[in-house]
Amino acid sequence: SGTTNTVAAYNLTWKSTNFKTILEWEPKPVNQVYTVQISTKSGDWKSKCFYTTDTECDLTDEIVKDVKQTYLARVFSYPAGNVESTGSAGEPLYENSPEFTPYLETNLGQPTIQSFEQVGTKVNVTVEDERTLVRRNNTFLSLRDVFGKDLIYTLYYWKSSSSGKKTAKTNTNEFLIDVDKGENYCFSVQAVIPSRTVNRKSTDSPVECMGQEKGEFRE
């Protein structure tokens, strides 16, 4: 009998935020199944999402083993088992992904302002240290644990009554800023990795304003 029209995957794309990493591709399968393999440059290929009709594969468990490694994935296309096909021996069709280095390329997730506290004319703003899926000694590391001083936060703050924004930066997760007494301020933060060439900045956090429940005021 004849051959099947197995088609190679295409548009292989890494989608990664705070190291949660999924490989996506096209097309939706018709009479075929896929298997994804992932490897480091020096490692062996490891099969994931084996014999699947999905067009995405969660590779987080593999890349968090060493986020500074560079990974390559490939998607194999196989004729489905119910397809009657006979041809000469031939390797399965596959397509390679772009290389992916999680530490350099994972998107920074939208940060969250955990709290702010005013003491006189000072306000302490704390950014939530988001947990990642990277593990060390059986515990999940935070974004700060992984990136260390490579990660900074930029604080945007302004008086509720005006639109003029000020900025502050920190390489911890806390800001201590000067404010005018008796004025309410609004805050938004952004995560930044200045040393990167791509995906340097996160989206801005939701805005939090003084006079809301996250804040605390002390004379």
Epitope: S47, F50, G87, A89, G90, E91, P92
Partner: nanobody
Framework: QVQLVESGGGLVQPGGSLRLSCTAS????????MGWHRQAPGKGRELVAV???????HYADFVKGRFTISRDNAKNTVYLQMNFLRAEDTAVYYC????????WGQGTMVTVSS
């Protein structure tokens, strides 16, 4: 053309075990999938189990916990250990290898009957 030769079928009582083997006539790349399908009398062919070159497996729900697929890449051979066999497992079992195309064996008959 890859030739696949199955063996190990036969008659077995309910609750019994059989081990099927399938060997390819030439070297099978580790990028090939190997596996087993079956066809019961009067029914269509259905997937039983498949295995990747690095040993990742996928099973049909109806055999999970009863059947185990394994593969010896050096011998170009795939095995199917079938335990706790039931009358409804009676079928012709076909080995297959999938690369660019599907390659099928001639099948081996498994009959589960008391």
């Amino acid at each position: 053309q890859v030739q696949l030769v199955e063996s190990g079928g036969g008659l077995v009582q309910p609750g019994g075990s059989l081990r099927l083997s399938c060997t390819a006539s030439e070297t099978i790349s580790s990028t090939y999938i190997m596996g087993w399908h079956r066809q019961a009398p009067g029914k269509g062919r259905e997937l039983v189990a498949v295995i990747s070159g690095d040993g990742v497996t996928h099973y049909a729900d109806f055999v999970k916990g009863r059947f185990t697929i394994s593969r010896d890449n050096a011998k170009n051979t795939v095995y199917l250990q079938m335990n706790f066999l039931r009358a409804e497992d009676t079928a012709v079992y076909y080995c297959y290898a999938a690369g660019r195309w599907n390659h099928w064996g001639q099948g081996t008959m498994v009959t589960v009957s008391s």
